[in-house]
Amino acid sequence: FKVATPYSLYVCPEGQNVTLTCRLLGPVDKGHDVTFYKTWYRSSRGEVQTCSERRPIRNLTFQDLHLHHGGHQAANTSHDLAQRHGLESASDHHGNFSITMRNLTLLDSGLYCCLVVEIRHHHSEHRVHGAMELQVQTGKDAPSNCVVYPSSSQESENITAHHHHHHH
């Protein structure tokens, strides 16, 4: 399996909410002995490998933001801790999983990574990750809504969302 990042760059105004998304692609074994561990963290574009370093998102570690379930089951973080920090990670039945960040500030700008670990009984763990950039802007040059740039091309999409409101 692979992880796809539909958008490689999110440009958002301060105060907006954004949902960063990853998608699990390829054959996903739904057997009893297979589970998936999914999580999010901040990182840097390392010389050796992007997403190698795991940094917290708003002081929450990848351990705090994880989702753990089988195949294409839905799940979401119900932790009060995450929600107190304006964060929520979620996963649906179609292999999509996301992290929503509310009330963005300039400090939220940076590289974000999603990680999926496939745990197969008595086999090696299989790890894959996706990376995307978040740029939070302020002032007259900032967009009124989040603008997202697809990974495959440079065409941008404007996400119509109001400040302090969740968007999809």
């Epitope: 990680l115 745990i119 008595h122 763990e125």
Partner: antibody
């Protein structure tokens, strides 16, 4: 604070049994996979057993398979290791350690000493 | 099982000196390797994860590199509290295995 505390070690005769416990505090125990790791006196570290956050899957080192049983009680924030048919070579300090998929042992207890001797 | 061989077994150095520790795997472990520090009477502490990343709170004098079968841990300038035993550990395959350790002692 965030910690793991092992208990239940002691002196036991070959062929005997012991049950080790590990009490977790300061973090959401039910989110974490857990492992037991041992260290014979003056020797290196050896991974013994692993249990997922839900209690399955479970793995054992070949040297303890069929003799040791790992279990957990998430309601009590506790991890256990039932050790049967103990041998002299099982003598070691036993540590419980926090684990996660795609991660490493990032929190360890201080260990409990198990001595198997006649 | 994957065997991790650490060298040297003992390293005798003075504070301020540079320490270079090696860990070699019997087969590739990709970058799924960690380094731990253990002081007498204490539990091990995670220093490095995924071959080259410092764990939370680990000083910058600790650095590491490598992938596949050859890995190195470097302490740029030894502090008195760095004299300890260092272990590498892989999580690429079952069972999880550790190296036999390198003792860094005061010369």
């Amino acid at each position: 604070q965030v910690q793991l505390v092992e208990s239940g070690g002691g002196l036991v005769k070959p062929g005997g049994s012991l049950r080790l416990s590990c009490a977790a505090s300061g973090f959401t125990f039910s989110d974490y996979y857990m492992s037991w790791i041992r260290q014979a006196p003056g020797k290196g570290l050896e991974w013994v057993s692993y249990i997922s956050n839900s209690g399955s899957p479970i793995y054992y080192h070949d040297s303890v398979k069929g003799r040791f049983t790992i279990s957990r009680d998430n309601a009590k924030n506790s991890l256990y290791l039932q050790m049967n048919s103990l041998r002299a070579e099982d003598t070691a300090v036993y540590y419980c350690a926090r684990d996660l998929p795609g991660w490493y042992f990032d929190l360890w207890g201080r260990g409990t000493l198990v001595t198997v001797s006649s | 099982e994957i065997v991790l061989t650490q060298s040297p077994a003992t390293l005798s150095l003075s504070p301020g000196e540079r320490a270079t520790l090696s860990c070699r795997a019997s087969q590739s472990v990709s970058s799924y390797l960690a380094w731990y520090q253990q002081k007498p009477g204490q539990a091990p502490r995670l220093l490095i994860y995924d071959a080259s990343n410092r764990a939370t709170g680990i000083p910058a004098r600790f650095s590491a590199s490598g992938s596949g079968t050859d890995f190195t841990l470097t302490i740029s300038s030894l502090e008195p509290e760095d004299f300890a035993v260092y272990y590498c550990q892989q999580r690429n395959n079952w069972p999880r295995t550790f190296g036999q350790g390198t003792k860094v002692e005061i010369k």
